[in-house]
Interface confidence: medium
């Protein structure tokens, strides 16, 4: 979690002198409670916006907006604390609006916005706006919270943001997986314009089961520049054991901008259709593992193999 470095955030508006300050998320009013405190924010809204940094990078940001209630407590409103909590890491970042003048009622409702919290793709956040000073220990809460889910890099607008592009969002491998026969699976995909290696993970499942009955990893060396954007194909030779028939192929690139953390793409091949009069299916789950020559699951023998070609 971080704040956008440009432009400087502004909270002042007509009729209000205000400045934005970094906050430790522990306002002084927690430690020294006040007798009179303002009411809670109203109509808190969080939206996905996009903003450029000073260097020209594009980032997703949380656009936070709320209004004040039309009661007399605005006379005691000294500012607001904005808190963003990333739910999967418990990381929290706060800023404080410090009012430098007293608020007065006027012809329109007071409205505040802040769009400087940079958020990450495919993450969920809890956004809280606390009016300051915070309430006394047993006082009514004067904050409002909302959860905010940031779309992943598949989202059209997200795809062109710097974090998504860094993780390889512009690469579309257009994977096709084809069962050649009972023992061969062919994987085709488009290479990206970078001399980096790829990894193919084949995970196989029995029909209608979600526990994998086999995993196999295959390494594809870095293509040469003349192979960039070309189709590459890999043929995996499998052990043919009944039941382990649904195959998920996942391709992981290792681009320089994201290394081990690049976006992965996958495709699935379903089990073949059952005949009208199916053979009885055994009540066990077959488990198998091919022996591979060039793959990473390498044994002393060479019963199974994987080989790949690049098409120009």
């Amino acid at each position: 979690l971080r704040l956008l470095d440009f432009p400087a955030p502004v909270c002042a508006q007509e009729g209000l002198s205000c400045r934005v300050k970094n906050s430790t998320c522990l306002d002084d009013s927690w430690i020294h409670p006040r007798n009179l405190t303002p009411s809670s924010p109203k109509d808190l809204q969080i939206q996905l916006h996009f903003a450029h940094t000073q260097q020209g990078d594009l980032f997703p940001v949380a656009h936070i907006e709320w209004t004040l209630q039309t009661d007399a407590s605005i006379l005691y409103l000294e500012g607001a604390e904005l808190s963003v909590l990333q739910l999967n890491t418990n990381e929290r970042l706060c800023v404080r609006f410090e009012f430098l003048s007293k608020l007065r009622h006027h012809h329109r409702r007071w409205r505040f916005t802040f769009s400087h919290f940079v958020v990450d793709p495919d993450q969920e956040y809890e956004v809280t706006v606390h009016h300051l000073p915070k309430p006394i220990p047993d006082g009514d809460p004067n904050h409002q919270s909302k959860n905010f889910l940031v779309p992943d890099c598949e989202h059209a607008r997200m795809k062109v943001t710097t974090p998504c592009m860094s993780s390889g969002s512009l690469w579309d491998p257009n994977i096709t997986v084809e069962t050649l026969d009972t023992q061969h699976l062919r994987v085709d995909f488009t290479l990206w314009n970078e001399s980096t290696h790829y990894q193919i993970l084949l995970t196989s499942f029995p029909h209608m089961e979600n526990h994998s009955c086999f995993e196999h990893m295959h390494h594809i060396p870095a293509p040469r520049p003349e192979e960039f954007h070309q189709r590459s194909n890999v043929t995996l030779t499998l052990r043919n054991l009944k039941g382990c028939c649904r195959h998920q192929v996942q391709i992981q690139p290792f681009f320089s901008s994201c290394l081990n953390d690049c976006l992965r793409h996958s495709a699935t091949v379903s089990c073949p259709e059952m005949p009208d009069t199916p053979e009885p299916i055994p009540d066990y789950m077959p488990l198998w593992e091919p022996r591979s020559g060039s793959s990473d699951y390498k044994d002393d023998d060479d019963k199974g193999s994987s080989h790949h070609h690049h098409h120009h």
């Epitope: 993970l201 995970t203 526990h211 994998s212 009955c213 086999f214 995993e215 990893m217 054991l241 055994p282 066990y284 789950m285 077959p286 488990l287 198998w288 593992e289 022996r291 990473d296 699951y297 044994d299 023998d301 019963k303």
Partner: antibody
């Protein structure tokens, strides 16, 4: 050379939990799954389950389902096996082994004693 | 689950003699069978996989054969270090299962 080094012996009370670690070295950790096998005193070998070090996929023995959890930490090339609600018949040497099916390298074993 | 039955439970053999250990599966496991050797206080050591392929570093006196339901581990000329317990294991189906073991002891 490939090595799997397990954590030390444990003595636990019935109902408690135990977490055994298995640190791998000498190969790329995420290229091979880790299986767990146990052996009660004077008894044969019993397969407990397997975890993919790459995807985190797991398969557990039916009789241990709900009591066992296998995890990995790829940053330290370490696999973990946690067994909960321990009973006296869980007293055994617990082994980690490399690969999903045929186990080509084994840890030295961790003796877990369950006794009140 | 597939039940693996080993016989005999104990085999008494003199050094230099041939030892033949048997392993039977309750249903076909194709060639998806491994053999392990275990000495007291030690972890099992892989000997054979895919029914007949020797693991790395295993001496040629150990050989495996069979497919389907009946498998054999043969030690052509027993050395003193071969006295141990031997287990077979199938990896054709979940759950993976081991035989009860055959103890090879000095006659």
């Amino acid at each position: 050379q490939v090595q799997l080094v397990q954590s030390g012996a444990e003595v636990k009370k019935p109902g408690a939990s135990v977490k055994v670690s298995c640190k791998a070295s000498g190969y790329t950790f995420t290229r091979y799954g880790i299986s767990w096998v146990r052996q009660a005193p004077g008894q044969g070998l019993e397969w407990m389950g397997w975890i993919s070090t790459y995807s985190g996929n797991t398969n557990y023995a039916q009789k241990l389902q709900g009591r066992v959890t296998m995890t990995t930490d790829t940053s330290t090339s370490t696999a973990y096996m946690e067994l909960r609600s321990l009973r006296s018949d869980d007293t055994a040497v617990y082994y980690c082994a490399r690969r999903q099916l045929y186990f080509d390298y084994w840890g030295q074993g961790t003796l877990v004693t369950v006794s009140s | 689950e597939i039940v693996m039955t080993q016989s005999p439970a104990t085999l008494s053999v003199s050094p230099g003699e041939r030892a033949t250990l048997s392993c039977r599966a309750s249903q076909s496991v194709s060639s998806n069978l491994a053999w392990f050797q275990q000495k007291p206080g030690q972890a099992p050591r892989p000997l054979i996989y895919d029914a007949s392929t020797r693991a790395t570093g295993v001496p040629a006196r150990f050989s495996g054969s069979g497919s389907g339901t009946d498998f054999t581990l043969t030690i052509s000329s027993l050395q003193s270090e071969d006295f141990a317990v031997y287990y077979c294991q199938q990896y054709d189906n979940w759950p993976l299962t081991f035989g009860g073991g055959t103890k090879v002891e000095i006659k």
